[in-house]
């Protein structure tokens, strides 16, 4: 993709490419892509697939080059690689390319699915597992129950899904989930469709979420083990804050209004 003049790996080992503050961000965030070479270099290039010429150059006599992407737009998302070169190398010769870095610029991550395993009908004494499944790995997943303001459970998962276990006696109810990036600046997903868990013999009812006024506005968990609890100031002012620990940042994070209220 980059150039026909890339030599064998043993000659010029690949650099490392990382993103600050994160690889998943909302539009308007300033992103810095850092390319670190294993040896001092003279020129660094940032490449996107299918383009022979570098997208950006940095001429620095060091092991680190920073590429600044100001107030990113969704179009600036995609796959990036970087290479480096030294003046004593032949013309057009670059190092091996770094591993790919995928930058994702989105307002809200895609809606997860929420399913019950083995099913939405719970027998006496049986537990049920709820699987909240998104499309991205290394996300934090949050489970909500109708009528309960705080998150019921949360999990960080290396997989694109997380499983939440509900004890049989307490399982019946209406649930919803979402996921978010594990650290600030947080990017939240759309909320899942609701899932109704019922007792055996009752049968699950299909209920629109708009009839579930107790679902509160989700936000990253207030005390996620292994992640610093986000403060309100770490969120963009995309809406009002309904709960002190549940910042409202996204298009979908209002609770459905009660029937008597035409809107929030």
């Amino acid at each position: 993709d980059i150039t026909p003049s890339v030599p064998p790996a043993s000659y010029h080992p690949k650099p490392w490419l990382g993103a600050q503050p994160a690889t998943v961000v909302t539009p308007g965030v300033n992103v810095t892509l850092r390319c670190r070479a294993p040896q001092p270099a003279w020129r660094f290039g940032l490449f996107k697939p299918g383009e022979i010429a570098p997208l950006l150059f940095r001429d620095v006599s060091s092991e680190l080059a920073e590429f600044f992407l100001e107030e990113v737009t969704p179009a600036q998302g995609g796959i990036y690689r970087c290479c480096y070169r030294r003046p004593d190398w032949g013309p057009g010769v670059w190092s091996q390319p770094s591993d790919v870095l995928e930058l994702l610029v989105t307002e809200e991550l895609p809606r997860p699915s929420l399913v019950a395993l083995p099913g939405p009908v719970v027998g006496p004494g049986a537990n049920v597992s709820l699987r909240c499944a998104g499309r991205l790995r290394n996300m934090s997943f949050v489970l909500y129950r109708e009528g309960v303001a705080a998150p019921l459970q949360y999990r960080h998962s290396a997989q694109p899904w997380a499983d939440f276990t509900l004890l049989g006696a307490r399982a019946p109810g209406t649930y919803s989930c979402y996921y978010h990036t594990p650290s600030a600046p947080y990017v939240l997903s759309q909320r899942s469709e609701v899932l109704v868990i019922s007792w055996e013999g009752e049968g699950p009812e299909a209920r629109p979420a708009s009839s579930a006024p107790g679902m509160q506005a989700p936000g990253p968990p207030p005390s996620d083990p292994g992640a610093q609890a986000p403060s309100l100031s770490s969120f963009r002012p995309r809406g009002l804050v309904l709960q002190p620990l549940l910042p409202q940042t996204q298009d979908s994070w209002d609770p459905a209004p009660p029937p008597s209220d035409p809107g929030v």
């Epitope: 539009p27 989105t106 919803s176 979420a209 298009d251 209002d254």
Partner: antibody, heavy 123, light 107 residues
Framework: EVQLQQSGAELVKPGASVKLSCTAS????????VHWVKQRPDQGLEWIGR????????KYDPKFRGKATITADSSSNTAYLQLSSLTSEDTAVYYC????????????????WGQGTSVTVSS | DIVLTQSPATLSVTPGDSVSLSCRAS??????LHWYQQKSHESPRLLIK???QSISGIPSRFRGSGSGTDFTLSINSVETEDFGVYFC?????????FGGGTKLEIK
């Protein structure tokens, strides 16, 4: 092909209500959000509100509260705008529009618009 | 509410001219600003999103720039099909708001 097909023109009497529809084709409305926008004759655009059709969640401009109610039926891939207690001030063209989205989520620009529904309030 | 002020209200130009339309926000909205074109008796059409991102199918003569509170839509060498009204819209805070529009008309 992505399309938003809106219901036909309405002539209604003051004090009455009207329900406008916006039927999507070429995409599933549950994947995005549907917004409604008002445009009075020879005037600018006014944002009314939006719905997340998958969960029925709505957001309104406060000045349209009590006037507009947005709903959706994902089984028919249709969003609705109901306007109540109509007055001459509600005479306008009403547009539905969807938010742009892709495999990796939403952005907040409105990339496809319906053709508009003209509502005339007159006795 | 964030107020978007567009200027001028009307711009009279000759085809082939290059023009700049302004949209000013009452407070900073970073790059959460989108531009729409509306021709007579038609629906609005998205031209530029996030202040500067071009849209597939929109001619390259349309270019957006700006950040914070001041934004510009530039049209390089206006064509007859470009006449109409141009609106800016912010998606930074609730409620969403539109500018009052700039009418681009033939001189």
């Amino acid at each position: 092909e992505v399309q938003l097909q809106q219901s036909g023109a309405e002539l209604v009497k003051p004090g009455a209500s009207v329900k406008l529809s916006c039927t999507a084709s070429g995409f599933n409305i549950k994947d995005t959000y549907v917004h409604w926008v008002k445009q009075r004759p020879d005037q600018g655009l006014e944002w009314i509100g939006r719905i997340d059709p998958a969960i029925g969640n709505t957001k309104y401009d406060p000045k349209f509260r009590g006037k507009a109610t947005i709903t959706a039926d994902s089984s028919s891939n249709t969003a609705y705008l109901q306007l109540s207690s109509l007055t001459s001030e509600d005479t306008a063209v009403y547009y539905c529009a969807r938010l742009s989205y892709g495999n990796y989520g939403l952005d907040y620009s409105m990339d496809y618009w319906g053709q508009g529904t003209s509502v005339t309030v007159s006795s | 509410d964030i107020v978007l002020t567009q200027s001028p209200a009307t711009l009279s130009v000759t085809p082939g001219d290059s023009v700049s339309l302004s949209c000013r926000a009452s407070q900073s909205i970073t790059n959460n600003l989108h531009w729409y074109q509306q021709k007579s008796h038609e629906s609005p059409r998205l031209l530029i999103k996030y202040a500067s991102q071009s849209i597939s199918g929109i001619p390259s003569r349309f270019r957006g720039s700006g950040s914070g509170t001041d934004f510009t839509l530039s049209i390089n060498s206006v064509e007859t099909e470009d006449f109409g009204v141009y609106f800016c819209q912010q998606s930074n805070t609730w409620p969403r708001t539109f500018g009052g529009g700039t009418k681009l008309e033939i001189k």
